[in-house]
């Protein structure tokens, strides 16, 4: 009786269980009653990452430097090339097919999370008591200067974009 299901790493063809090709190899011909499955290694700059019955290997991804991409992990016969972005840039998608410049946090906002090759800068508004007076992809919100600890008094209140201005205390005669 011909099988209706096959073991792991096998496939059913012409009422027969044939061995799948291992990662890094493609199918040339199915097995027969008398012969094994015939597989062939993928060519240079090609890959297959699973046990398969593919007749063509996939091409390695190209990390195009003109799109701000660079290689994170070189491709092999069993794995695709993994791209990431040049410093200061991040991927526009999970597939990392192109890069965009990291966003800067405007004055009044600080960096909550610094960007990586795959994620953009996350900004947060500076809460009361903190400020940021620059546009930056790295700077967090800074605390207002404590005038008291310097034996000074607040002459000008701080905002989310400016520090407080301290001055000397008025001396009573």
């Amino acid at each position: 009786e011909p099988p209706t299901a096959c073991r792991e790493k096998q496939y059913l063809i012409n009422s027969q269980c044939c061995s799948l090709c291992q990662p890094g190899q493609k199918l040339v011909s199915d097995c027969t009653e008398f012969t094994e499955t015939e597989c062939l290694p993928c060519g240079e700059s090609e890959f297959l990452d699973t046990w398969n019955r593919e007749t063509h290997c996939h091409q390695h991804k190209y990390c195009d430097p003109n799109l701000g991409l660079r290689v994170q992990q070189k491709g092999t016969s069993e794995t695709d090339t993994i791209c990431t972005c040049e410093e200061g840039w991040h991927c526009t998608s999970e597939a990392c097919e192109s890069c965009v410049l990291h966003r800067s946090c405007s004055p009044g906002f600080g960096v909550k999370q610094i960007a990586t090759g795959v994620s953009d800068t996350i900004c947060e508004p500076c809460p009361v008591g903190f400020f940021s007076n620059v546009s930056s992809a790295f700077e967090k919100c800074h605390p207002w200067t404590s005038c008291e600890t310097k034996d000074l008094v607040v002459q000008q209140a701080g905002t989310n974009k400016t520090d407080v201005v301290c001055g000397p205390q008025d001396r009573l005669r």
């Epitope: 990662p23 290694p41 190209y62 992990q73 070189k74 092999t76 794995t79 695709d80």
Partner: antibody
Framework: EVQLVESGGGLVKPGGSRRLSCAAS????????MHWVRQAPGKGLEWVAY????????YYADTVKGRFTISRDNAKNSLYLQMNSLRAEDTAVYYC????????????WGQGTLVTVSS | DIVMTQSPDSLAVSLGERATMSCKSS????????????LTWHQQKPGQPPKLLIY???TRESGVPDRFSGSGSGTDFTLTISSLQAEDVAVYYC?????????FGGGTKVEIK
């Protein structure tokens, strides 16, 4: 027998150009990726550039990006390195090496050709 | 870029003795997809081009004597010559084959004591 033979080396003035060639024989050239690697006199090895078997993928070292161009002609079993705006620090023996689709390593190297950049 | 650091710079060993050299990479060379470490060793004899010795950290290239062995994983790798022969006098380079730019260590020069 696998053979890689580089040619085109010689004395070049700073700012000048040179084109290196690598003639391949003893294997199916179009099935292999190719690299250029250089070695300054008395120094270690420095990777320069890579081109995939089908010309689709090209990578360069930052030190040569924008000045050097790697190319190949599979019909002529030849690899090339066009070197422009040459500097004294480009003085080296230039090797071509092949990369197969199994090991993904440089498994055969040519004998090298010496490029000297000097006024 | 991945920085490859080899030690020692040179090594003098008696014939028949063991020679061991180290190679450290500034980041892991482990391919997450196939779990192979893409660390390659090349041998360069005086006046000759480099020759592939070992790939994937420990797999000897065809024709390489079994006195040569490679080991390690992640960022720390070792090349061992179990019984040094006169023809093993050379500079040995480790190489990052994991990512571009491909980078080489500075080399370890092996001499006869």
């Amino acid at each position: 027998e696998v053979q890689l033979v580089e040619s085109g080396g010689g004395l070049v003035k700073p700012g000048g150009s040179r084109r290196l060639s690598c003639a391949a024989s003893g294997f199916t050239f179009s099935d292999y990726g190719m690299h250029w690697v250089r070695q300054a006199p008395g120094k270690g090895l420095e990777w320069v550039a890579y081109i995939s078997s089908g010309n689709r993928i090209i990578y360069y070292a930052d030190t040569v990006k924008g000045r050097f161009t790697i190319s190949r002609d599979n019909a002529k079993n030849s690899l090339y390195l066009q070197m422009n705006s040459l500097r004294a620090e480009d003085t080296a023996v230039y090797y071509c090496a092949r990369q197969d689709g199994y090991r993904y390593a440089m498994d055969y190297w040519g004998q090298g050709t010496l490029v000297t950049v000097s006024s | 870029d991945i920085v490859m650091t080899q030690s020692p710079d040179s090594l003098a060993v008696s014939l028949g003795e063991r020679a061991t050299m180290s190679c450290k990479s500034s980041q892991s060379l482990l391919n997450s997809g196939n779990q192979k470490n893409y660390l390659t060793w090349h041998q360069q004899k005086p006046g000759q081009p480099p020759k592939l010795l070992i790939y994937w950290t420990s797999t000897r290239e065809s024709g390489v004597p079994d006195r040569f062995s490679g080991s390690g994983s992640g960022t720390d790798f070792t090349l061992t010559i179990s019984s040094l022969q006169a023809e093993d006098v050379a500079v040995y380079y480790c190489q990052n084959d994991y990512t571009y730019p491909l980078t080489f260590g500075g080399g370890t020069k092996v001499e006869i004591k």
